[in-house]
């Protein structure tokens, strides 16, 4: 469902991935240098950034975000 | 800098209704949301409600649902937490505090109130 | 309403030691936590957000871990003036809810 509209609540932010606001609605997520092998599942459709440097992703599927805008 | 200054304390009487407010200044008023937490004496935070100065949009702890009402006024940047038909249990310290992205960054002082016959 | 529980209530450590604070959320909040320090007679301050994110200006001893249910707060090595109250609060969904605190005090 929507998330509900809160000044209070805290966006998803990936397990041991590093987030930081970015105004009011949008989110900032570093996930570099985590040896991920795969793309975050939880990823936020209000993600504004991802930082996915340093890691051990070797291939991309077609549209591999389509929950992001 | 960023300051939010409450107003002073008070006391009550069962049944009566406290006006609270949270003058803000050193940031722009309509950017940020407004929280409304309590700590009654010995225990720990708890959350009343929130509104966004934008455009007066609120969400309310159910608990309270009824009995608090949040308003802003966006011309002096001060927001209001009323709350009605009091009781022992609402002696507290009332904070406003600000948020942005779901976190609380800046609080004010807190307000006491004492609720007693 | 998602319920925050914190352990211990009360820590007694001495300045230079390392503190854990625990918090634990009664169901998955998705790393959506904060902490806050409070302290008589002061204004309460963030510390953490996002369950690792580290407020403006508050020292690198300070730092969040945990994932799912259970959040740990770290001071790597406590200076005089840490010793205060904690809280954690979530912020996964409305009504967002406390710990009941916990109390670092000088051993």
């Known amino acids: 469902g929507s998330s509900p509209r809160s000044g209070v609540l805290l966006r998803g932010c990936p397990t041991h991935c590093h987030c930081e606001p970015d105004g009011r609605m949008l989110l900032r997520v570093d996930c570099s240098d985590l040896g991920l092998s795969e793309l975050p599942s939880n990823l936020s459709v209000f993600t504004s950034y991802l930082d996915l440097s340093m890691n051990n992703i070797s291939q991309l599927l077609p549209n591999p975000l389509p929950s992001l805008r | 800098q960023v300051q939010l200054v409450q107003s002073g304390a008070e006391v009550k009487k069962p049944g009566a209704s406290v006006k609270v407010s949270c003058k803000a200044s050193g940031y722009t008023f309509t950017n940020y949301w407004m929280q409304w937490v309590r700590q009654a004496p010995g225990q720990g935070l708890e959350w009343i409600g929130e509104i966004d100065p934008s455009d007066s949009y609120t969400n309310y702890n159910q608990k309270f649902q009824g009995r608090v009402t949040l308003t802003v006024d966006t011309s002096t940047s001060t927001a209001y937490m009323e709350l009605s038909s009091l009781r022992s249990e609402d002696t507290a310290v009332y904070y406003c505090?600000?948020?942005?992205?779901?976190?609380?960054?800046?609080w004010g002082q807190g307000t006491t109130v004492t609720v007693s016959s | 309403e998602i319920v925050m529980t914190q352990s211990p209530a009360t820590l007694s450590l001495s300045p230079g030691e390392r503190a854990t604070l625990s918090c634990r959320a009664s169901?998955?909040?998705?790393?959506?936590l904060n902490w806050y320090q409070q302290k008589p007679g002061q204004a309460v301050r963030l510390l953490i957000s996002y369950r690792s994110r580290r407020h403006t200006g508050i020292p690198a001893r300070f730092s969040g871990s945990g994932s799912g249910t259970d959040y740990t707060l770290t001071i790597s090595s406590l200076e005089p003036e840490d010793f205060a109250v904690y809280y954690c609060q979530q912020g996964n969904s409305l009504p967002p809810t406390f710990g009941g605190g916990t109390k670092l005090e000088i051993k």
């Open positions: 505090a600000r948020s942005l992205s779901g976190y609380v960054d800046y």
């Open positions: 169901q998955d909040i998705s790393n959506r």
